[in-house]
């Protein structure tokens, strides 16, 4: 049909800015590039009906359904959702196409369904159908990868039983320490499930899908390294596979490795050995100890011995349930305005935790670093010297942990004032919490030295804004001070700040701020 307009249906995904929530202005958010929903004419339907591709949206995501109409003349429109009519305001873009948009903020179950858009142009009437559903991520899982020996081969298979199917990668590093950070040139990634090169210094397997990323490191004892001051400890849950690699390098092949559990040699079938010559013609041997499914009696000291190296041990602890061990008592800190400072939490946990730092309802990424003593540490330095309450939250499959921190920034008070017909109030957020004085300015006291003590009401910690205490002082108006200028001053060990208020009849009040150091 020649009269039919050229229609384009697009989906715009938005990145939510907290400030935009609840506003329904045309484009309250940062937007991603539009995705074409390919509006196609629906066959065998009465009237002209276009159908857009089905739209799946994450819970709380914000989207715009948009229709671009290339038709001559003006258009009018109406949205219908669940039998309710919704306002529709078309506008025209630079190419003079009619643009009709439906913004859905913070997608919820109640906003899922069929959105019908009725458009009337000078030439014809037609309907556009959008079907919006919530993506079912409840069935999604991301499980920590585990290792299995490949049958009849000296190789490890990495398995992560996750939905959707993850990308499985080996992350290999042949250098020591800091240079084994994820994005360092010393780190090599291989997207494959089977690894044959098992001689590297650091071997991890990672699985990634929509839910994020989980990694498992191949626990290694290196007989050529100086042993840690504290015995390395490996935690596992009942039923999980145990893998420990013992590695040793020697000038020639004349040495052997053995594994013992509590002074008893491991049974055949619970270990395998590999060896290779390195570039400088030294011999590298590795001996794996493995148990396909651990039980409580697999707990104990696993010792790797060599005929040419001092032996080293690791303590393997089998637990029924995961845990997070850390002190959860809240901590308060007081720092100067430019002092460098980081919050830190030291913990021992198994399985590895997922964590967040939260301040003022905003979450920040959480990094954790393993310490030599089996503990891990998470630090948060990105507080930008904002006082308030900071929350560290950690969880794994079996346990949860929350720790509160309060940050106080030492600074002189800053005063804000407001007044009504009956009283004047001053507020300050300085720290330490300030004390207040009120002074009356008059002919007798042009420098406002006449102190007011009657009718003053001080409230420490009037409101707690995300842990930030605010102190206030209120002066009830009496006939004696009506029509006068009064000055409220907040002072602490770092200085004083004042604000002058004209106490007259109700109306706008001029405020004059004095800063006295």
């Amino acid at each position: 049909n020649q009269d039919l307009p050229v229609i384009k249906c697009v989906l715009i995904n938005h990145k939510n800015n907290d400030s935009s929530v609840g506003k329904s202005s045309s484009y309250p958010m940062v937007s991603e590039s539009p995705e074409d929903l390919g509006c196609a004419l629906r066959p065998q339907s009465s009237g002209t009906v276009y159908e857009a591709a089905a739209v799946e949206v994450d819970v709380s995501a914000s989207i715009t359904l948009q229709v671009l109409v290339d038709a001559p003349g003006n258009i009018s429109c109406l949205w219908v959702f669940k039998h309710s009519s919704l306002n529709c305001q078309p506008h025209f873009d630079l190419q003079n196409r009619g643009v009709v948009s439906m913004v859905i903020l913070k997608m919820t179950e109640t906003q899922a369904g069929e959105y019908l858009l009725f458009i009337q142009s000078e030439a014809t009437n037609y309907t556009i159908l959008f079907t919006v559903s919530i993506r079912n991520t409840l069935l999604y899982t991301l499980r920590r990868p585990y290792f299995r020996k490949m049958e009849n081969q000296d190789a490890l298979v990495c398995i992560s039983e996750s939905v959707p199917e993850p990308i499985v990668e080996w992350v290999l590093c042949d250098s020591q320490g800091e240079s084994c950070k994820e994005e360092s040139p010393a780190v090599v990634k291989k997207e494959e499930k089977v690894l044959h090169e098992l001689f590297g210094t650091d071997i991890r397997c990672c699985a990634r899908n929509e839910l994020g990323r989980e990694c498992t490191r191949l626990f290694t004892i290196d007989l050529n390294q100086t042993p840690q001051t504290t015995l390395p400890q490996l935690f596992l849950k009942v039923g999980e596979p145990l893998w420990i690699r013992c590695k040793a390098v020697h000038v020639n092949h004349g040495f052997g490795l053995t594994w013992e559990l509590e002074n008893k040699a491991l049974e055949e079938g619970n270990y395998f050995e590999m060896s290779t010559y390195s570039t400088n013609r030294t011999m590298i041997r590795i001996l794996f100890a493995f148990v396909s499914s651990v039980a409580r009696n697999d707990t104990g000291y696993y010792t790797c011995s060599s005929s040419k190296h001092p032996s080293q041990s690791a303590l393997v602890t089998i637990v029924e349930k995961g845990f997070i061990n850390a002190t959860n008592s809240s901590e308060d800190y007081e720092i100067d305005q430019y002092e460098e400072f980081c919050f830190s939490v030291r913990f021992k946990a198994y399985p590895q935790i997922r964590c967040t730092w939260t301040f003022s309802r905003k979450s920040f990424p959480c990094e954790q670093k393993g310490l030599d003593n089996g503990y891990s540490i998470s630090k948060f330095c990105n507080h930008k010297h904002q006082p308030g309450e900071y929350i560290f939250h950690a969880e794994n499959d079996d346990a949860q942990f929350t720790k509160m921190f309060t940050l106080n920034i030492r600074r002189k008070p800053q005063v804000l004032a407001e007044a009504s017909a009956s009283q004047a109030s001053c507020f300050s957020d300085g720290y330490p919490l300030p004390s207040w004085t009120w002074k009356k300015c008059s002919d007798k006291s042009p420098n406002c030295t006449e102190e007011i003590t009657e009718g003053v009401w001080n409230r420490k910690a009037n409101r707690k804004v995300f842990g930030q205490w605010v102190s206030s002082s209120t002066l009830n108006m009496s006939e004696a001070i009506k029509g006068f200028l009064v000055k409220c001053c907040a002072y602490n060990s770092l200085g004083t700040s004042c604000e002058t208020i004209l106490l007259n009849s109700p109306g706008p009040f001029p405020f004059i701020q004095d800063n006295i150091s």
């Epitope: 990308i167 994820e182 994005e183 997207e191 499930k193 990634r208």
Partner: antibody
Framework: EIQLQQSGPELVKPGASVKVSCKAS????????MYWVKQSHGKSLEWIGY????????SNNQKFKDKATLTVDKSSSTAFMHLNSLTSEDSAVYYC????????WGQGTTLTVSS | DTVLTQSPATLSVTPGDSVSLSCRAS??????LHWYQQKSHESPRLLIK???QSISGIPSRFSGSGSGTDFTLRINSVETEDFGMYFC?????????FGAGTKLELK
């Protein structure tokens, strides 16, 4: 030598469906995800999804969720992509690739949807 | 979705020139970015994986750098066989996405 051999070009009518195959050789089929990509004429590439041949687990681009179904036949080391309810928008070259980093690619299967 | 913006859209060069192709991600993607070359009527070919890792069989004149949001593919001393389309692809967040491509053409 590692090779991914795709089935030949297809000319189908709107509303029909088609099954594109990708036969792998020269490596262990179950050790790598099989990745499917669409390239419309003169355009960039679009990820459709991938399948783990070991367990049949998949990850799909939501855009192709109702369009493409990925399967494998381990015995013949072959991956399949079934495309349904075809429209002219589905006319494109479809590629299979080994792994999401795509170190080996099939030669592509050209699909033309036309009445 | 993570949008990959490639620039320039077209690059006209003379054999022997050295060039840099840019790929910018709309959000941080660590180093999970890969570069492909595609010649007319051919399948894409992997050049660089994970930002900088070289691929066996790919000439050493191709190198990659960057992590986070900004990535570069460098071709030292372009040869006539290098002309074609270059795509970047991220495998950090779902859906996996490709850039629109940079066309490397003969000046």
């Amino acid at each position: 030598e590692i090779q991914l051999q795709q089935s030949g070009p297809e000319l189908v009518k709107p509303g029909a469906s088609v099954k594109v195959s990708c036969k792998a050789s020269g490596y262990s089929f179950i050790d790598y995800n099989m990745y499917w990509v669409k390239q419309s004429h003169g355009k960039s590439l679009e990820w459709i999804g991938y399948i783990n041949p070991y367990n049949g687990g998949t990850s799909n681009n939501q855009k192709f969720k109702d369009k493409a179904t990925l399967t494998v036949d381990k015995s013949s080391s072959t991956a399949f992509m079934h495309l349904n309810s075809l429209t002219s928008e589905d006319s494109a070259v479809y590629y299979c690739a080994r792994g999401t980093t795509g170190d080996y690619w099939g030669q592509g299967t050209t699909l033309t949807v036309s009445s | 979705d993570t949008v990959l913006t490639q620039s320039p859209a077209t690059l006209s060069v003379t054999p022997g020139d050295s060039v840099s192709l840019s790929c910018r991600a709309s959000q941080s993607i660590s180093n999970n970015l890969h570069w492909y070359q595609q010649k007319s009527h051919e399948s894409p070919r992997l050049l660089i994986k994970y930002g900088f890792q070289s691929i066996s069989g790919i000439p050493s004149r191709f190198s990659g750098s960057g992590s986070g949001t900004d990535f570069t593919l460098r071709i030292n001393s372009v040869e006539t066989e290098d002309f074609g389309m270059y795509f970047c692809q991220q495998t950090n967040s779902w859906p996996l996405t490709f850039g629109a491509g940079t066309k490397l053409e003969l000046k």
